[in-house]
């Protein structure tokens, strides 16, 4: 009887050792959905156990109260509950506690206090119409109808937002409404003219820290104005035979001109400078016209108009031909974002603060879609992404403006997004040797690259054998494989390697010879020493004993006529001749292995080749070395940053002292780093190749028809004056 | 339905004593604060003391503070006034009314007693 | 203190009538304001509390409204049983005041 009762207490005690009581709701919010319902949320919102919940409510300011339960039929584990009309009365305050009940106990919440003004959401207003009024420009007057459901009595506060039709950045407008009119209005000033702009309405009493959802969205029109203004630019051309400089303008709606606006027609007029009186005008509807011009400075206007008048006029400066140029651009950057490519530029000039930004593809063909933006009072360029196209590569110049003098470009190229090369290599083997092999390449076309091709990677192996790789710069297009096997057949492919990727060129095959040149000079040089030496011993034993040697060479032949012959029986000339025979044999089949010129079935075709090719790799050979030094010199001189690479520069306007560095590998997301690299070390930017093609006119600022970048390779001698080269 | 039933209160003679007491039903008793409000004969309304739902907090009008003791007895619903020292001018109808049910609530009186009179002369 | 002021002192309305009673505090009650009436040899009756909340079992035809330090009792329609003393009080502070009382009766 009484171990029973003992272990009854130790279970009793076991019990409640093990008894887990519910978590402490916490974390007490609750929200006032005006005359529909008033609900509470917390946390714990699951229990390891099963937990039901009560809620205690006090209302009606306290002289009321009443319990909502969250019990196994309803909510269950739910850590939510609402109370109904008709006891939701607005204003109160209620007071909130949280009772979390399991089968081991009770935990009460703190208490929390409510005052419903302060947590009332009530529905959304709703827009009826967004219109211009007439003779008021740039104002749109807003009209909704205030929520059925919202306290009459009380001060709604609203928040409009707005933005132009083609933008997704909001803005937003905060004002309070005391009338309690259904029908509300609000007049949106300081729009930009003759604008569609999408509106939506939110609302909450005064107090409230709870909005009403947003309203549904609706478009209005601002009314139509004179056109706002023109962006002028122009692409200078080479001059012609005759003297006349063609000129390409270019026009567009200036930046902040309504989405909307059409102009019907452009006026142009221009004159050179100090001579008005030489004025020539055109009218056109396009937004592009070339002008031709003489050799002195222009000056261009142009003016966009509509049936309410013209809009400011757009001015430009053509230089004088003969007209020097200033240069303030040091270096400069491309980097990608996430979804933008962000150009950056460092100046020596800080009074410009005015920068035109061309961009255009660099394709091999005529530059199709040329585009141009104008840049204030910043360093930097930025464009989305996806105005770009993938795996193109763009040409991107930057021309610093100086109240009317537009100064020397400064470019960069760039794509938004590298892909593998599009096709390989188109690869051949020159100069085969015996171990070694000169493999030569062609650039991959420009319009097959996808990305600036970082390396390219040599693939060989032997018939059976394993496979062998090298990887060479970009700039390299040659290289000379050696400690290859005698007389081996070898495959042999091209990798081209951009950041995405690499790409194989062709496969080819070849043989290594079984026999160097220099072997058969050694062979032709021994048998032609050991005939010298012959000769030379004979001239001497001829010296010596002329009668011998006479005797030799010229033998005597007996007479016929006092031959005995006849007499001589046939066995012994049989004899005789056999004798002859065994004192002077000869194997033919060692004779094949042992002849010096014998040789495989190619080497003779290849022979011919060889010998030439031989004077080739040993000139090939030195200018390889001479490279070698001068990449190992320009390596010290400029130490380029990380995400700077080396490819064609493309700005046609070259300064005399400084080569640029002018494309940019383009690391995601790495801005900042590459700004301090940059910018850090200006002076060291080193160019890798400089490109140009045709003659370059000291006039052509970045002209469109000097825009093709064909690369120099391989100089054997610098070009002088015009620009300064660092051979690569 | 909720009921305040007061005591019967009586004659005192100034500087005497007189315990009042009410009797709850028809709610939770201990839940609400409760109240003593008094109505002298042909005058108004005047509050005299609040005692909190647990007796922990209790309020006075500055007149009765130190003669008067307000007091509950959760357990048998009961709310109690205690007058000492009384003076003619603490002669009223003392009504016993129920209070909020929270220490913030505004201190009205939704439900009152039937009133118990309380005379103070000599 | 709290001084509420109430006004009229007395008032007589015919049947039908509509009534306002004024209940003027001496500093900002912030709606901590309840409606009380009496009738001879009777317990007040809660009426109105919160400045215009009804309590439960009043006639329609009682509203209360204001806010800050002025406040108002409105009976639309006068009927017999509205005869009676209105008090208006103040929740908010201790001590707890009430207005000297309003005498409606019927004309």
């Known amino acids: 009887m009484m171990w029973a009762k003992v272990l009854w207490m130790l279970l009793l005690l076991c019990k409640l050792s093990l008894a887990v009581l519910p978590a402490k709701p916490e974390n007490i919010s609750c929200i006032f959905y005006y005359e529909e319902n008033f609900t509470c949320t917390w946390s714990p919102e699951k229990e390891a156990s099963y937990t039901w919940y009560k809620v205690k409510r006090t209302y009606s300011y306290g002289y009321k109260s009443d319990i909502c339960s969250t019990d196994n039929s309803t909510r269950g584990n739910h850590a939510s509950c609402s109370f109904l009309p008709p006891t939701i009365t607005n204003p109160d305050n209620y007071t909130i506690q949280v009772e979390a009940q399991n089968a081991d106990g009770i935990m009460k919440s703190d208490i929390t206090y409510w005052n419903l003004d302060a947590i009332m959401k009530i529905e959304p207003p709703e827009i009826f119409s967004v219109k211009s009024v007439l003779g008021i420009k740039r104002m749109l007057q807003i009209k909704w109808i205030r929520p059925v459901l919202a306290p009459h009595s009380s001060t709604l506060k609203y928040t409009l937002r707005f933005r132009t039709i083609n933008s997704a950045y909001w803005m937003e407008v905060n004002f309070t409404k005391e009338d309690i009119d259904r029908d509300e209005t609000y007049n949106l000033t300081e729009l930009q003219a003759f604008t569609e702009y999408v509106m939506t309405l939110r609302c909450a009493p005064a107090e409230s820290m709870f909005w009403s959802g947003w309203s549904q969205e609706k478009v209005g029109t601002t009314e139509e104005e004179a056109p706002y203004g023109l962006d002028l630019w122009r692409v200078l051309k080479p001059a012609m035979v005759d003297g006349r400089r063609p000129v390409q303008l270019m026009w567009k709606k200036a930046t902040g001109a309504p989405v909307l606006e059409k102009a019907l027609g452009y006026n142009i007029w221009y004159f050179p400078e100090n001579n008005t009186n030489l004025t020539e005008t055109v009218n056109t509807t396009n937004q592009t016209h070339e002008l031709y011009l003489g050799g002195k400075t222009y000056w261009v206007y142009v003016v966009s108009y509509n049936s309410l008048g013209e809009s400011p006029v757009a001015t430009l400066r053509i230089p004088a031909l003969n007209e020097k140029t200033f240069q303030c651009i040091e270096a400069m950057q491309a980097c990608l974002t996430q979804d933008q490519l962000v150009v950056e530029w460092q100046s020596s000039a800080p009074e410009v603060d005015t920068w035109m930004v061309e961009w255009f593809p660099d394709v091999d063909s005529e530059p199709s879609s040329f585009s141009w933006e104008s840049v204030s009072q910043a360093r930097n360029w930025t464009i989305q992404k996806d105005e770009l196209k993938p795996l193109w590569c763009y040409n991107i110049s930057v021309y610093p403006v100086l109240r009317d003098r537009v100064g020397q470009p400064y470019s960069t190229q760039a794509y938004v997004q590298e892909g593998i090369p599009s096709a390989g290599p188109v690869t051949q083997a020159d100069s085969i040797g015996v171990k070694t092999v000169t493999i030569t390449w062609k650039e991959i076309p420009k319009s097959k690259r996808n990305g600036f091709i970082k390396n390219y990677t040599i693939f060989y192996q032997a018939e059976d054998g394993k496979e062998f790789s090298k990887t060479v710069n970009s700039n390299i297009l040659q290289y000379r494989l050696e400690s290859l096997t005698r007389r081996t057949s070898y495959s042999l492919q091209v990798m081209a390697s951009t950041n995405a990727g690499g790409t194989n060129g062709t496969k080819i095959n070849f043989k290594t010879l079984s026999i160097s040149v220099l072997e058969i000079f050694f062979i032709t040089s021994l048998v032609g020493g050991g005939f010298l030496i012959l000769i030379m011993l004979t001239v001497a034993y001829g010296l010596k004993k002329p009668n011998k040697l006479k005797h030799l060479c010229w033998p005597d032949v007996p007479n016929p006529a006092e031959s005995s012959i006849a007499t001589w029986r046939g066995d012994d000339f049989k004899d005789k001749l056999n004798l002859k025979e065994s004192d002077d044999p000869v194997n033919m089949e060692e004779d094949q292995v042992l002849k010096p010129y014998s040789a495989p079935t190619d080497f003779i075709d290849k022979l011919v080749v060889n010998f030439e090719n031989f004077l080739e790799e040993v000139s090939t050979e030195e200018l390889g070395k001479s490279q070698e030094n001068i990449l190992k010199e320009e390596k010290n001189k400029h130490v380029t940053s990380p995400y700077c690479l080396h490819h064609p520069p493309i700005s046609t306007e070259i300064p005399q002292r400084k080569p640029q560095q002018l494309c940019s590998r383009i690391p995601e997301g790495t801005c900042s780093e590459t700004k301090e690299q940059l910018f850090s070390s200006v002076q060291s930017l080193g160019p890798d190749h400089l490109c140009e093609e045709g003659e370059p006119n000291p006039y052509l600022k970045n002209s469109v028809t000097t825009r093709e970048f064909v690369c120099l390779k391989n100089f054997k001698t610098k070009p002088k004056e015009k620009f300064s080269v660092a051979v690569a | 339905e909720v009921q305040l039933v007061e005591s019967d209160g009586g004659l005192a003679q100034p500087g005497r004593s007189l315990k009042l007491s009410c009797a709850a039903s028809g709610f939770t008793f201990s839940d609400y604060y409760m109240a003593w409000v008094r109505q002298a004969p042909t005058k108004g309304l005047e509050w005299v003391a609040t005692?909190?739902?647990?007796?922990?907090?209790?309020y006075y009008r500055d007149s009765v503070r130190g003669r008067f003791t307000i007091s509950r007895d959760n357990a048998k619903s009961t709310l109690y006034l205690q007058m000492d020292s009384l003076r003619s001018e603490d002669t009223a109808t003392y009504y016993c009314?129920?209070?909020?049910?929270?220490?913030?609530?505004?201190?009205?009186?939704?439900?009152w007693g039937q009133g118990t009179l309380v005379t103070v002369s000599s | 203190d709290i001084q509420m002021t109430q006004s009229p002192a007395s008032l007589s309305a015919s049947l039908g009538e509509t009534v306002t009673i004024q209940c003027q505090t001496s500093?900002?009650?912030?709606?901590?304001l309840a409606w009380y009436q009496q009738k001879p040899g009777k317990s007040p009756q809660f009426l109105i509390y919160g400045a215009s909340r009804l309590e439960d079992g009043v006639p329609s035809r009682f509203s209360g409204s204001g806010s800050g330090t002025q406040y108002s009792l409105k009976i639309s329609s006068m009927q017999t049983e509205d005869e009676g003393v209105y008090f208006c009080?103040?929740?908010?502070?201790?001590?707890?005041?009430f207005g000297a009382g309003t005498k409606l009766e019927l004309k």
């Open positions: 500093e900002d009650i912030y709606s901590g």
């Open positions: 009080q103040q929740g908010l502070k201790y001590p707890n005041t």
């Open positions: 009314a129920r209070g909020p049910l929270t220490d913030w609530a505004p201190n009205w009186f939704a439900y």
């Open positions: 005692i909190s739902y647990d007796g922990s907090s209790t």
